[in-house]
């Protein structure tokens, strides 16, 4: 988590705080989900490894008009050191599987929680 710009704060946000807020937001999305998230929009699945934050943003940024994930998109931009725009796939090494946004969020959440439990947030 090298770049933490993009968060509305007076100073730098400690990595653990920023990651916590991302997890909290993903938890809120999964717990408050009633209708299909983002109308069942499909996004590219990603490898949850190095460069995951940029890859996640590049995948989710192609979903438009979905207010439920706008905050997540903003938060992910704070973890990605380069500007990401729709249709950009420089971090998405493998583009062979599309999944629903709801499943994408769930997979990302599970992985981030595991990183945090292991103390790997720096």
């Amino acid at each position: 988590l090298t770049c933490l710009g993009g968060f509305a704060s007076p100073g730098p946000v400690p990595p653990s705080t920023a990651l916590r807020e991302l997890i909290e937001e993903l938890v809120n999305i999964t717990q408050n989900q009633k209708a299909p998230l983002c109308n069942g929009s499909m996004v590219w699945s990603i490898n949850l490894t190095a460069g995951m934050y940029c890859a996640a943003l590049e995948s989710l940024i192609n979903v438009s008009g979905c207010s439920a994930i706008e905050k997540t998109q903003r938060m992910l931009s704070g973890f990605c050191p380069h500007k990401v725009s729709a249709g950009q796939f420089s971090s998405l090494h493998v583009r062979d599987t599309k999944i629903e946004v709801a499943q994408f969020v769930k997979d990302l959440l599970l992985h981030l929680k595991k990183l945090f439990r292991e103390g790997q947030f720096n």
């Epitope: 653990s16 705080t17 916590r20 807020e21 997890i23 909290e24 938890v27 929680k113 595991k114 945090f116 439990r117 292991e118 103390g119």
Partner: antibody
Framework: EVQLVESGPALVKPTQTLTLTCTFS??????????VGWIRQPPGKALEWLAH???????RYNPALKSRLTISKDTSKNQVVLTMTNMDPVDTATYYC???????????????WGQGTLVTVSS | DIVMTQSPDSLAVSLGERATINCRAS??????????MNWYQQKPGQPPKLLIK???NLESGVPDRFSGSGSGTDFTLTISSLQAEDVAVYYC?????????FGQGTKVEIK
């Protein structure tokens, strides 16, 4: 109903290894976001977190005691075991096991506790 | 390590009166949405019991005379109308990072 029961020796000698077992019921350590921790309390003193283990076998230890502690689980037996090496009289305390009751699946707070077992370290 | 400091160390309150316990963390344990601060009650000879999690969320079955507040580094546990069964030692605990630490405890007695 959630229950946790600690078992182990009431008396250990200095330099010996303490092995404590937490046997629980009412929940499963194979369930996502579930975990079990150990906390101790010297007589008349405050609580000290020692270690905990998550359903997916992620283990965390108090850095001040990490070299002496090992935590493990046996999901099929509903048990969590803590070992503590090189016991010293200052380790005399009531040792509690407790279930982690997190909302988020990564932070450890403890919503159910065992009655505790008093361990005295003396020669 | 995050140091948790409770005040006062002991407190004597008349039955039916308000009891207030403070807990200060040596660094912030809050995000913009949640505070990773928990409160426990320990009666003599018993294990601790979780009262409040995430600073203000009352645990199921806990009487509503107990409440928690605060964010950042400063937190408060309030018993709005002290009952005889509330005599105990109360501990705060952060769940922000390893190692999870507890306050030294506040003993609440009847005046």
């Amino acid at each position: 109903e959630v229950q946790l029961v600690e078992s182990g020796p009431a008396l250990v000698k200095p330099t010996q290894t303490l092995t404590l077992t937490c046997t629980f019921s009412g929940f499963s350590l194979s369930t996502s976001d579930m975990g079990v921790g150990w906390i101790r309390q010297p007589p008349g003193k405050a609580l000290e977190w020692l270690a905990h283990i998550w359903w997916d076998d992620v283990k965390r230890y108090n850095p001040a005691l990490k070299s002496r502690l090992t935590i493990s689980k046996d999901t099929s037996k509903n048990q969590v075991v803590l070992t503590m090496t090189n016991m010293d009289p200052v380790d005399t305390a009531t040792y509690y096991c407790a279930r982690i009751g997190t909302n988020y699946g990564y932070d450890a707070l403890f919503d159910y506790w065992g009655q505790g077992t008093l361990v005295t370290v003396s020669s | 390590d995050i140091v948790m400091t409770q005040s006062p160390d002991s407190l004597a309150v008349s039955l039916g009166e308000r009891a207030t316990i403070n807990c200060r963390a040596s660094q912030s344990v809050s995000t913009s949405s949640y505070s990773y601060m928990n409160w426990y009650q320990q009666k003599p000879g018993q294990p601790p019991k979780l009262l409040i999690k995430y600073a203000s969320n009352l645990e199921s079955g806990v009487p509503d005379r107990f409440s928690g507040s605060g964010s950042g580094t400063d937190f408060t546990l309030t018993i709005s109308s002290l009952q005889a069964e509330d005599v105990a030692v109360y501990y705060c605990q952060h769940s922000w990072e390893i190692p999870y630490t507890f306050g030294q405890g506040t003993k609440v007695e009847i005046k």
